[in-house]
């Protein structure tokens, strides 16, 4: 059974993948952005159910096509390069999802922008950490 | 003195149109780029619009768009809002405001006097 | 859409006496360049907005010192150290990290 130490570390590092989403988030959906247009025509695909850790197993394995699309942001909107600013998710994702267990992600019929995919695995973390609290 | 004016407000019957303009003066217009923020009577903000300092990005709120277009004439200091489709819930004073997020992004740190746009039959 | 709320929705003030406007944002407004877009407006009766602050606590040019910023992520905070008759009216809070959208605005008065 998870402990209270255990259950706070998972809230802590559901947090902190939050707010990196939310930063990519704010970084990609914004007029000021110059490359929004061509960023929105990138697709990406949506999990088919999201509801538990084991399920972040989708999420990493759209980690390697975020960071393509991040790559062609100006250098000045992101003050981290994309490709730390993905290693320090993946590090977060793999520590949550926990490679125990192997999961075979199943994703829905519909491709989504980037926005959209963003969206989602932010409201799946407020989700998870809304149990938690 | 940096300024910014609208004109073109008036009132209109729903479904008809109406053009906004938004006269810059002070500065130099083509490094700005420029939004459309609304206010209904006696409620808050709301942002209509922005265009790109060069023309080459324009976005939309998602109550105007496919209605409202927005659009500028660097050579003129002119900022536009071509608004079809009117409804009466586009009643407002519209306000154009300027931003330049390349060099120091203040926010919208000038804004013009509005223009009031009501919508009736 | 980022949803910004501000509390209280009016606040009345003694002359001279400090006032304190909060405002929350749904979602961090944390840019990926670092920056964190959050702008105070202030409108007085029958006038457009004008600019206060900019990036939570930058007071634009010719802003008295009397109006401060603070905060962090999601919760902001715009403080008016000593309230002069001049600071009647309503102050809104901005958020320009994604496409701009405002709180609802506070009303400032005199009691």
């Known amino acids: 059974a998870p402990t209270s130490s255990s259950t706070k570390k998972t809230q802590l590092q559901l947090e902190h993948l939050l707010l990196d989403l939310q930063m990519i988030l704010n970084g990609i959906n914004n007029y000021k952005n110059p490359k929004l247009t061509r960023m929105l025509t990138f697709k990406f695909y949506m999990p088919k159910k999201a509801t538990e850790l084991k399920h972040l197993q989708c999420l990493e394995e759209e980690l390697k096509p975020l960071e393509e699309v991040l790559n062609l942001a100006q250098s000045k909107n992101f003050h981290l390069r994309p490709r730390d600013l993905i290693s320090n998710i993946n590090v977060i994702v793999l520590e949550l999802k926990g490679s125990e267990t192997t999961f075979m992600c199943e994703y829905a019929d519909e491709t989504a922008t980037i926005v959209e995919f963003l969206n989602r695995w932010i409201t799946f973390c407020q989700s998870i950490i809304s149990t938690l609290t | 003195q940096v300024q910014l004016v609208e004109s073109g407000g008036g009132v209109v019957q729903p479904g008809r149109s109406l053009r906004l303009s938004c006269a810059a003066s002070?500065?130099?217009?083509?490094?700005?780029?420029m939004h459309w923020v609304r206010q209904a009577p006696g409620k808050g903000l709301e942002w209509v619009a922005v265009?790109?300092?060069?023309?080459?990005?324009?976005y939309y709120a998602d109550s105007v768009k496919g209605r409202f277009t927005i659009s500028r004439d660097n050579s003129k200091n002119t900022l536009y809002l071509q608004m079809n489709s009117l409804r009466a819930e586009d009643t407002a004073v519209y306000y154009c405001?300027?931003?330049?997020?390349?060099?120091?992004?203040?926010?919208?740190?000038?804004w013009g006097q509005g223009t009031t746009v009501t919508v009736s039959s | 859409d980022i949803v910004m709320t501000q509390t209280p929705l009016s606040s009345p003030v003694t002359l001279g006496q400090p006032a304190s406007i909060s405002c929350r944002s749904s979602?961090?407004?944390?840019?990926?360049?670092?920056?964190?877009?959050l702008s105070w407006l202030q409108q007085r009766p029958g006038q457009p907005p004008r600019l206060l602050l900019y990036?939570?606590?930058n007071r634009f040019s010719g802003v008295p010192d009397r109006f401060s910023g603070s905060g962090a992520g999601t919760d902001f905070t715009l403080k008016i150290s000593r309230v002069e008759a001049e600071d009647v009216g309503v102050y809104y809070c901005?958020?320009?990290?994604?496409?701009?959208?405002f709180g609802g605005g506070t009303k400032v008065e005199i009691k």
């Open positions: 405001a300027r931003e330049e997020w390349e060099l120091e992004d203040y926010g919208m740190d000038v």
């Open positions: 002070g500065f130099t217009f083509s490094s700005y780029g």
């Open positions: 265009i790109w300092y060069d023309g080459s990005n324009k």
């Open positions: 979602h961090s407004l944390v840019h990926s360049d670092g920056h964190t877009y």
């Open positions: 990036k939570i606590s």
């Open positions: 901005m958020q320009t990290t994604q496409f701009p959208t």
